[in-house]
């Protein structure tokens, strides 16, 4: 069987939802020694980079300029070593934000409520779309979907403490083409034992862990790989 | 300070509508869904229903979601209640209300709508 | 719709006297059970909410407990000025329904 380099890390520096006319950068990480990476869109080819010098760093970034919604939708990348070439990473949906109108998002029964109420986020948009997205910020790949004419209802159940936190919701054109972000509703959950409203905390895994760790080699070189071997494995 | 203040009482023939505003102040109007409830003399407190002035979306209790119409006026932070077909039992005070924090917590000083031939 | 049914519908008691009213709900209300305050000719004050919490600026003596149905609101030692109607309402399932409540008088 023809041998193959594992499958590289593929992600979106900062964040995968990208505003039109914006910069998106994807992050390629593969292995020291790599001398060319490949960034494949839909499954073509769309651009190549060759890190200089290859032995020395451990991906590389593709740049895309002016976003779109003809450049949203699914990345991957390759690398080779020599004439090795490694498997096809993991497909990464990269989004076009700032399409078209801003949603209203709203929470009933109210933005403060007590642990165990039922909660229903409403997202409504006026304009021609069937799809509404609702996210949680530091939360931003748990993307709940629902469908509707002009409003989609997100019933959340009876809510906890874990619950609390700001939501954003958008209205999608497809998949990969949302509108503005509406504006974000603080959701307040107090416990059953506390008195008081506890405002959001950090989450777990916060986005700004969607950054590119690509690192230049030192002695610290192995530790970092493993480190972000285990932060990847972590988000995942 | 968040006030609710409802428009003055109203004497209407059976048959007639009415139309009960109130007038929002002191937080986010388009935040917080506004209650209407009903209470007829020496009675007990009725929940009519719910708009939500950030969409207008809208619950109505059963019992008055064929003569009763929730609307607002984002632009002046007001809310409506109109109330058609009216009855003799339809003589009450009307209350807005809303739900700021845990419960109805704020409500307008009651709007008193007499019907009468 | 769940029925909210408050007893007794009117009570006298003395200055001082602890007061208790109950209210049983037609099903389980999961402690979504509020307690409010009306005083002749004025709109309706929030004294408790989810059973048991004081709403903010509410005396100590007011006090809420109850589970599943059924459901207490308890007035520690009454005072002149917590002359009023007193009723319950559930606020698990909509539409959001009240008791017929209390008249509370001084003896």
């Known amino acids: 069987p023809k041998q193959t380099l594992p499958k590289p890390i593929i992600r979106a520096e900062s964040t995968y939802m990208v505003p039109k006319e914006k910069q998106a950068t994807l992050c390629c990480q593969g292995s020291y020694g790599a001398v060319e990476y490949q960034l494949h869109f839909e499954g073509s080819l769309f651009a190549v980079e060759r890190p200089k010098p290859p032995e020395r760093i451990n991906g590389v970034k593709f740049h895309i300029p002016d976003m779109n919604s003809r450049k949203a939708g699914r990345y991957s990348c390759i690398y080779r070593v020599g004439e090795l070439w490694s498997e096809r990473s993991d497909l990464l949906d990269l989004v076009v934000t700032e399409m078209y109108d801003t949603p209203t998002l709203s929470v009933h029964p109210g933005p403060e409520v007590t642990s165990g109420e039922k909660v229903t986020f409403y997202c409504r948009l006026d304009t021609a779309t069937s799809m509404f997205l609702l996210l949680k910020e530091g939360r931003s790949r748990d993307v709940q979907r629902s469908y509707g004419k002009v409003q989609a209802e997100f019933p959340m159940g009876p809510v906890t403490t874990a619950h609390r936190g700001s939501y954003r919701c958008f209205g999608s054109y497809n998949n990969y083409a949302w509108s503005f972000p509406s504006e974000p509703v603080k959701l307040l959950v107090t416990g059953d034992i506390e008195n008081t409203s506890l405002a959001p905390t950090d989450p777990t895994f916060p986005d700004s862990w969607d950054t590119c760790l690509l690192t230049r080699e030192t002695g610290l070189q192995k530790d970092l790989a493993l480190w972000d071997h285990t932060a990847q494995n972590l988000l995942r | 300070q968040v006030q609710l203040v409802q428009s003055g009482a109203e004497v209407k023939k059976p048959g007639a509508s009415v139309k009960v505003s109130c007038k929002a102040s002191?937080?986010?109007?388009?935040?917080?869904?506004m209650h209407w409830v009903k209470q007829a003399p020496g009675q007990g407190l009725e929940w009519i229903g719910e708009?939500?002035?950030?969409?207008?979306?809208?619950n109505y209790n059963e019992k008055f979601k064929r003569r009763a119409t929730m609307t607002v006026d984002k632009s002046i932070s007001t809310a409506y209640m109109e109330l058609s077909r009216l009855r003799s039992d339809d003589t009450a005070v009307y209350y807005c209300?809303?739900?700021?924090?845990?419960?109805?917590?704020?409500w307008g000083q009651g709007t008193l709508v007499t019907v009468s031939s | 719709d769940i029925q909210m049914t408050q007893s007794p519908s009117s009570l006298s008691a003395s200055v001082g006297d602890r007061v208790t009213i109950t209210c049983r709900a037609s099903?389980?209300?999961?402690?979504?059970l509020n307690w409010f305050q009306q005083k002749p000719g004025k709109a309706p004050k929030l004294l408790i909410y989810?059973?048991?919490r004081l709403h903010s600026g509410v005396p100590s003596r007011f006090s809420g407990s109850g589970s599943g149905t059924d459901y207490t609101f308890t007035i520690s030692s009454l005072q002149p000025e917590d002359i009023a109607t007193y009723f319950c309402?559930?606020?698990?399932?909509?539409?959001?329904?009240f008791g017929g409540g209390t008249k509370l008088e001084i003896k």
């Open positions: 309402q559930q606020g698990n399932t909509l539409p959001p329904t």
């Open positions: 209300a809303i739900r700021l924090r845990f419960a109805l917590d704020y």
């Open positions: 002191g937080y986010t109007f388009t935040t917080y869904w």
């Open positions: 099903q389980d209300v999961r402690n979504f």
């Open positions: 989810f059973t048991s």
């Open positions: 708009i939500n002035p950030g969409n207008g979306g809208t």
